[in-house]
Amino acid sequence: KFSKQSWGLENEALIVRCPRQGKPSYTVDWYYSQTNESIPTQERNRVFASGQLLKFLPAAVADSGIYTCIVRSPTFNRTGYANVTIYKKQSDCNVPDYLMYSTVSGSEKNSKIYCPTIDLYNWTAPLEWFKNCQALQGSRYRAHKSFLVIDNVMTEDAGDYTCKFIHNENGANYSVTATRSFTVKDE
């Protein structure tokens, strides 16, 4: 419950939230579990902690491992674990299963595809969408906030959808991509 799997691609931004939630006023300390080394909070570091969030800007394959977050209230300390895996970028179009977020289902009346993890990032529109690596074009596709809406959904719309956006941190931009499968169900 308080261990969470997170994954990302090398040279992209990855932001992980401590699985152990606390009130906003509580302090959070992050450690690299294997070495018990404290994660710095200074933003000049490529990997740094920012309250409930652990930021990899950008991520490297060597960052993979288990990170411990300790949330501290005035009287209680509670621990969570983030199991982070950073993968090399694939040269071909296929997105392997281990990089896929949960599958969503849609129908003619409800065809929203939410861009996974986007709420953790400081992003601004536009949000780009791809299906099986092809940029989506045409009036049936509408990028709305953090969703993709498909009008008049058809069986052929099933497939793997990737959202791509830019995370901004102190004026520096980092790319993020996330992919999930979309299935079409009958009403």
Partner: antibody
Framework: EVQLLESGGGLVQPGGSLRLSCAAS????????MIWVRQAPGKGLEWVSS????????YYADSVKGRFTISRDNSKNTLYLQMNSLRAEDTAVYYC????????????????WGQGTLVTVSS | EIVLTQSPATLSLSPGERATLSCRAS??????LAWYQQKPGQAPRLLIY???NRATGIPARFSGSGSGTDFTLTISSLEPEDFAVYYC?????????FGQGTKVEIK
């Protein structure tokens, strides 16, 4: 120093009503979830009801659902339990307690308890 | 609802002895389990949270262990003030539930 002080207990006939209060001090009452727990004479502890902090979402044990109402007045630092249609099996010491951590959708332990107020339901 | 079963119901021991109390959950509660101590005429007092962490001000002789469905509270060497009733409580989901209690009495 955190303090919780219950009041409002007493003897009431079956089918009657009672309103318990819990005055809180020594902490920022509005941000904490608050809980009522009861203990029948010589028995164990039973969770009765919880109320979220500023959001005010409420939860009830099946045994009291529809009869008891938990509420709070953050401006008065006071927790309430309105008890209607009381039964003999509601006879217990009623404690109010603080959940020092919980976030929306989760619960935690009870770190501070009041001294309790006795409710006796009998004819 | 999650049922917590404590054993034994009563534990008769002498001061200085080790007390081992058990709490078993009807389904997994991860580490969302607490232990409380209650003395006659008093409100319960929190001892252990998240299965194994001592609450502020609780002596080191109290320790908790376990995860999932099986938990243990250990008092390494009983002091006279430790004779009381002990309850476990799960907080993974509502309704919050308590065990029926274990009474630790003087032998």
């Amino acid at each position: 120093e955190v303090q919780l002080l219950e009041s409002g207990g007493g003897l009431v006939q079956p089918g009657g009503s009672l309103r318990l209060s819990c005055a809180a001090s020594g902490f920022t009452f509005s941000i904490y979830d608050m809980i009522w727990v009861r203990q029948a004479p010589g028995k164990g502890l039973e969770w009765v009801s919880s109320i979220r902090g500023e959001g005010g979402g409420t939860y009830y044990a099946d045994s009291v659902k529809g009869r008891f109402t938990i509420s709070r007045d953050n401006s008065k630092n006071t927790l309430y339990l309105q008890m209607n249609s009381l039964r003999a099996e509601d006879t217990a010491v009623y404690y109010c307690a603080r959940d020092p951590w919980s976030t929306e959708g989760s619960f935690f332990v009870l770190d501070y308890w009041g001294q309790g107020t006795l409710v006796t339901v009998s004819s | 609802e999650i049922v917590l079963t404590q054993s034994p119901a009563t534990l008769s021991l002498s001061p200085g002895e080790r007390a081992t109390l058990s709490c078993r959950a009807s389904q997994s509660v991860d580490d969302d389990l607490a232990w409380y101590q209650q003395k006659p005429g008093q409100a319960p007092r929190l001892l252990i949270y998240d299965a194994s962490n001592r609450a502020t001000g609780i002596p080191a002789r109290f320790s908790g262990s376990g995860s999932g469905t099986d938990f243990t509270l250990t008092i390494s060497s009983l002091e006279p003030e430790d004779f009381a009733v002990y309850y476990c409580q799960q907080y993974i989901t509502a309704p919050l539930t308590f065990g029926q209690g274990t009474k630790v009495e003087i032998k």
